[in-house]
């Protein structure tokens, strides 16, 4: 189920790459965030908290990512036209409950000016 399009700027372009921003509520302590391209899982990041508030970050499908207190950024490099597609942030909240899965996304448009290595 697609819950909706992101209500924020999801794609940030720089240096021939793109930062894809996946937000989550900042009260969330344990979650899994997956980046989907179409229906395919490109990246994932799981944050868990153990005893003594020790934080563990795991990735089964690793991408360059950055975690803040209310977002996960996934970075895609060397953009070309094949990157144009629908991208979705698939968030699974574990704690605090209730368990909740949300899917939000948008279409990544690739313009010549955003490509990494334009042929002169």
């Amino acid at each position: 189920e697609i819950n909706g399009s992101a209500n924020y700027e999801m794609f940030i372009f720089h240096n021939g790459g793109v930062q894809i921003l996946c937000k989550y509520p900042d009260i969330v302590q344990q979650f899994k965030m997956q980046l989907l391209k179409g229906g395919q899982i490109l990246c994932d990041l799981t944050k868990t908290k153990g005893s003594g508030n020790t934080v563990s970050i795991k990735s089964l499908k690793f991408c360059h990512s950055q975690l803040s207190n209310n977002s996960v950024s996934f970075f895609l490099y060397n953009l070309d036209h094949s990157h144009a597609n629908y991208y979705f942030c698939n968030l699974s909240i574990f704690d605090p409950p209730p368990f909740k899965v949300t899917l939000t996304g948008g279409y990544l448009h690739i313009y010549e000016s955003q490509l990494c290595c334009q042929l002169k």
Epitope: N3, G4, P25, N70, D95, P96, P97, P98
Partner: antibody, heavy 121, light 106 residues
Framework: QVQLQQSGPELVRPGESVKISCMGS????????MHWVKQSHAKSLEWIGL????????NYNQKFQGKATMTVDKSSSTAYMELARLTSEDSAIYYC??????????????WGAGTTVTVSS | EIVLTQSPATLSLSPGERATLSCSAS?????MHWYQQKPGQAFRLLIY???KLASGIPARFSGSGSGTDFTLTISSLEPEDFAVYYC?????????FGQGTKLEIK
């Protein structure tokens, strides 16, 4: 139906502590976190904090750190909040509220009816 | 801290009229929620995620807005709608409420 039953009114002396309760029914208690909110004439409504029934993790509004302590008893489906070193500024109605999520954020989907705490000598 | 300012503080209208309640945030928030409070009753969730109608809430209630300006609209007031309404933001810590708008019968 889903209900949050709060304990009755409390009259306490300055400097004392009070522990108020919130019992959940009509749903699986451990499947939701619980928030606490203060309502006073001076400050309207203030978010105090939340406790995860699942992990016992707590998240306090910094303003209430050291003033409020949230705990849960899973066996009785009850959340508790203890208020310490009470002053007249702590006189208020305290509400519990069940945590829920939308697509983008979180909110309280069910509230208790409130517990009135009066601090007076 | 994000300050939520509700206006007007009091709104006097008659049943059947349209009510528009505003909530202005001191800085941008991702979403707004709206609650109703009646004397001696528990708060009731009306709108979550800015515009989504909570379960069991009549369709005459609606929410809109983005950034710093949000609105709760009641299209045609019923006698039971006269109460105090609060906006709430949970996207910027510490999470905050507006001071409330009292909707009273004219």
């Amino acid at each position: 139906q889903v209900q949050l039953q709060q304990s009755g009114p409390e009259l306490v002396r300055p400097g004392e502590s009070v522990k108020i309760s919130c019992m959940g029914s009509g749903y699986t208690f451990t499947d939701y976190a619980m928030h606490w909110v203060k309502q006073s004439h001076a400050k309207s409504l203030e978010w105090i904090g939340l406790i995860s029934i699942y992990s016992d993790h707590t998240n306090y509004n910094q303003k209430f750190q050291g003033k409020a302590t949230m705990t849960v008893d899973k066996s009785s489906s009850t959340a508790y909040m203890e208020l310490a070193r009470l002053t007249s500024e702590d006189s208020a109605i305290y509400y519990c509220g069940r945590n829920n999520y939308g697509n983008y954020g979180w909110y309280f989907d069910v509230w208790g009816a409130g517990t009135t705490v009066t601090v007076s000598s | 801290e994000i300050v939520l300012t509700q206006s007007p503080a009091t709104l006097s209208l008659s049943p059947g009229e349209r009510a528009t309640l505003s909530c202005s945030a001191s800085s941008s928030v991702s979403y707004m929620h709206w609650y109703q409070q009646k004397p001696g009753q528990a708060f009731r969730l009306l709108i979550y995620d800015t515009s989504k109608l909570a379960s069991g809430i009549p369709a005459r209630f609606s929410g809109s807005g983005s950034g710093t300006d949000f609105t709760l609209t009641i299209s045609s007031l019923e006698p039971e709608d006269f109460a105090v309404y609060y906006c709430f933001q949970g996207s910027g810590y510490p999470y905050t409420f507006g001071q409330g708008t009292k909707l009273e019968i004219k």
